[in-house]
């Protein structure tokens, strides 16, 4: 007798999800010597344990603690790059500027980047048909809770000057409902973080507006200042320069200090 399956509004688990996570883990630990000690099978078991057999609208940060523990990683706390609504460019930047790190440059962020996953209550099956949508179904779904958990930990680890890359082409340059606006901003530690420097990336070739005067940036400045962290904003006008360096990664002068 076929079991009734809950239909969610979001896309289902990414195909070949277990194989993808395991393969990414192996690749990451091969490339990063400091993570060579990680047992990727244990990582997958912990990842799976966070959502399998659990109702996909009842996931908690606690469910991910075994995975967090296995994926514990030290990145230079003064070289953290946060981003909001401009992931690809942020990743191009850290691909070139190798001494800076986005969340997706860490093991846990790398494992889950661009993937979707969920299970079903009381069965060991992975749901490849549909998963809960954050808005239409529920916020405590496996994917949202994972990113909230790792984002909080990443922000808590930051120190000195923290950079955030923001998309100047969007109507809300700073969106307080984004992961950056709702999680990371509030988990920067004032006793460790001296300054948050926002890089507002301009899209248009002839764009010469001062987007640091945007009302949403003023809102961000207000939130950060109230947390006793200094705020700085810079207009960045030529994002194509990142790509030029990415195309020529052998050119060390793109990456090194001048």
């Amino acid at each position: 007798v076929p079991r009734w399956r809950q239909q969610w509004s979001g896309p289902g688990t990414t195909k070949r999800f277990p194989e993808t996570v395991l393969a990414r883990c192996v690749k990451y630990t091969e490339i990063h010597p400091e993570m060579r000690h990680v047992d990727c099978q244990s990582v997958w078991d912990a990842f799976k344990g966070a959502f399998i057999s659990k109702h996909p609208c009842n996931i908690t940060e606690e469910d991910y603690q075994p995975l967090m523990k296995l994926g514990t990683q030290t990145v230079p706390c003064n070289k953290i790059l946060l981003w909001s609504r401009i992931k690809d460019l942020a990743h191009q930047f850290t691909q070139v500027q190798r001494d800076m790190f986005t969340l997706e440059d860490t093991l846990l962020g790398y494992l889950a980047d661009d993937l979707t996953w969920c299970g079903e209550f009381n069965t060991s099956k992975i749901n490849y048909q549909s998963c809960p949508d954050w808005r239409k179904d529920c916020s405590n779904n496996p994917v949202s809770v994972f990113w909230k958990t790792v984002s909080r930990r990443f922000a808590e680890a930051a120190c000195d000057v923290v950079h955030v890359m923001l998309n100047g082409s969007r109507s809300k340059i700073f969106d307080k409902n984004s992961t950056f606006g709702s999680v990371e901003v509030h988990n920067l530690q004032p006793e460790k973080v001296q300054t948050l420097e926002a890089w507002v990336i301009h899209g248009g070739r002839e764009d010469s507006r001062d987007l640091c005067q945007d009302p949403t940036i003023k809102e961000l400045e207000s939130i950060i200042s109230k947390r006793n962290i200094q705020f700085s904003c810079k207009n960045i006008y030529r994002p194509d320069k990142f790509l030029q360096c990415v195309k020529n990664p052998e050119d060390s002068s793109c990456t090194s200090e001048i």
Epitope: D207, S232, D240, K241, Q244, E250, C254
Partner: antibody, heavy 120, light 107 residues
């Protein structure tokens, strides 16, 4: 090490033309924006023109727009500035300058300059 | 377009601290660069991104940028620091601008 060597300067009459070249070495030329900056005798620095690495984007100061054309040949590691309808006020030392990478838009390296004199 | 204003000249005794200012509307929203130029020579980048020093530039050179003013500071000024200094910023499109320059005299 990075080297930029300008050539093509000289004496030209008002209304005349001149083509400056800048031979680059010591870095991956196509990765960088390149620029021309000039300095009139006894005066300050003035940015003239810039070009992206690929080279799809070109930029010009208002003072030269429509008269000067920047271009590059990445296979030859060479930057050019075609100057037409020259005026006395274009008299200056012209420097070729390599942009800084990534989020920075300033000049990491400069050539020694080539003198352009516009006079009848 | 932003306009960058520098004092035409600054004098300092050897070993003292020289400060050269560069002002423009909301300059803090843009990265500022400083160049040193000696007579008959090409400019040399001494500070980029407001406060970063290129390799080979002595530690006595430092920079800051807040409000409407960027400042180049030379601590323990030496005779060899006598030169013209230019600030520069970029405000998008074809708006790459230099300040008018400051002549630093070491007395």
């Amino acid at each position: 090490q990075v080297q930029l060597v300008e050539s093509g300067g000289g004496l030209v009459q008002p209304g005349g033309s001149l083509r400056l070249s800048c031979a680059a070495s010591g870095f991956t030329f196509s990765s960088y924006y390149m620029n021309w900056v000039r300095q009139a005798p006894g005066k300050g620095l003035e940015w003239v023109s810039g070009i992206s690495g690929d080279p799809s984007n070109t930029y010009y100061a208002d003072s030269v727009k429509g008269r000067f054309t920047i271009s590059r040949d990445n296979s030859k590691n060479t930057l050019y500035l075609q100057m037409n309808s020259l005026r006395a006020e274009d008299t200056a030392v012209y420097y070729c300058a390599r942009d800084l990478p990534l989020v920075y838009t300033g000049f990491a390296y400069w050539g020694q300059g080539t003198l352009v004199t516009v006079s009848s | 377009d932003i306009e960058l204003t520098q004092p035409p000249s600054v004098s300092v005794a050897p070993g003292q601290t020289a400060r050269i200012s560069c002002s423009g509307d909301n300059l803090r929203h843009y990265y500022v660069y400083w160049y040193q130029q000696k007579p008959g020579q090409a400019p040399v980048l001494v500070i980029y991104g407001d406060s970063k020093r290129p390799s080979g530039i002595p530690e006595r050179f430092s920079g800051s940028n807040s409000g409407n003013t960027a400042t180049l500071t030379i601590s323990g000024t030496q005779a060899e620091d006598e030169a013209d200094y230019y600030c520069q910023t970029y405000t998008g499109g074809a708006s790459l601008v230099f300040g008018g320059g400051t002549k630093l005299t070491v007395l």
